[in-house]
Amino acid sequence: AGVFELQIHSFGPGPGPGAPRSPCSARLPCRLFFRVCLKPGLSEEAAESPCALGAALSARGPVYTEQPGAPAPDLPLPDGLLQVPFRDAWPGTFSFIIETWREELGDQIGGPAWSLLARVAGRRRLAAGGPWARDIQRAGAWELRFSYRARCEPPAVGTACTRLCRPRSAPSRCGPGLRPCAPLEDECEAPLVCRAGCSPEHGFCEQPGECRCLEGWTGPLCTVPVSTSSCLSPRGPSSATTGCLVPGPGPCDGNPCANGGSCSETPRSFECTCPRGFYGLRCEVSGVTCADGPCFNGGLCVGGADPDSAYICHCPPGFQGSNCEKRVDRCSLQPCRNGGLCLDLGHALRCRCRAGFAGPRCEHDLDDCAGRACANGGTCVEGGGAHRCSCALGFGGRDCRERADPCAARPCAHGGRCYAHFSGLVCACAPGYMGARCEFPVHPDGASALPAAPPGLRPGDPQRYL
């Protein structure tokens, strides 16, 4: 079970010359309402035939009065969706009729008068649970824009609303042979109830109440092996092992009919009965037109009504193929640059950028240092999507705002004592060592491994090298 939902976006004059006159006037104000009728399959039944899938009527729209001399604009619409509940499986292919009705609100005796303003019809393929499909239909000089979808009502799920979901009995997993119900991962698929008596070994069902046979079995309950029915074959020599007639080669062997055509023998050869949209001796010629509703996933059909005419489907984001039948993994093309994370949201593609990058595809490398000041005379250094400050002597931290303790790293070697100084640090070297960091030993004879200390400084005195 589920609901077919129809959203009317606009009803107004179509493009091109010959705009229709407004259906309402100052003398006869009116309001619109819509009726939708659904039938299963790609039927071409008359508009009057029953709406086997269901029908719905919208609320009345706002009252509209034409402005004299103005062209007919898009007319005000009723609020909300038209909803058509369906009790059984969603058929996947369906026919629709959408009627636009005018309710005249003049001073008619006996209440308002209704008249049919426009009727559009079409045949479409649609999977339940899919995205909203958008459509544009013309009726004379009028144009109707609308969206539609089919959704399952819990506990039903799946493209036909035939799989059932039940809350899990055990917290961790589903029972044997039963899958979790995506997207309701906390629920489990319930087993289908097939036709009573359907062979559990040789039969199965995809919809409640049916019994479909595995290969090699036949009969209403799949209890009859096919080998016994081959004894009834009218052709071929008798087989000594089974006592059955083994069919000889016939013109339909291997089914010469393409595209799902069914083959029947004729006195001289064979004949293919082609499915809708195909023709030719072997059903090899596609005569699909937009009237056959060939577009999936909300694709919009473009093409002529003539069987020779080409057609194609204008696909919504996330789908491709002549019939929009293929879902695109758009992230597999790695559209996000500079290590950005790709997110396919269905209706759009988003890139989540790493720090330091921006743009729809993370293609812009931000100037890491732009607007980033390093304090106290530090200079900004760019790199890898982040900024770093190279700080002046005596300062540290991310932005050089912290006064550094130059002695924290114990820079004076060989037991030298460190003194912080406004311009850096000073090392007072232990006896026998010299240099800015007390790194050089003084030779015992008084000679140094480096040039002697500047005049006026004895080895062991604090030395300051600026």
């Epitope: 544009i136 919009l300 473009v302 194609i312 204008h314 696909c315 491709q320 929009c324």
Partner: nanobody, 114 residues
Framework: QVTLRESGGGLVQAGGSLRLSCGAS????????VGWYRQAPGKQRVLVAV???????NYAHSVKGRFTISRDNAKNTVYLQMNSLKPEDTAVYYC?????????WGQGTLVTVK
Amino acid sequence: QVTLRESGGGLVQAGGSLRLSCGASEITLSDKTVGWYRQAPGKQRVLVAVISNVDSTNYAHSVKGRFTISRDNAKNTVYLQMNSLKPEDTAVYYCYARDFEAEYWGQGTLVTVK
């Protein structure tokens, strides 16, 4: 109102070739489904070649193998390469583009095959 500009039509001998071009200045064709319809005198318009917004192509049975539709996004132009032309290809060829919001037509270009 946006119109598409067709060019490349003309008179050609049977068996010859022509290349039609369809350009637009106010709209981008790369994200549209673009096709070529033709209309012979006294007949209805038939879509002979079409390229979708996701670059799938399709052709009318009568031109399959002879006509090729392609697009050049940099030039915002769609082409119809017509080879092995036959007298029955004589028609006015119209460029057509559409997306979910709107549709656009050209004025048409005449192709005559003698």
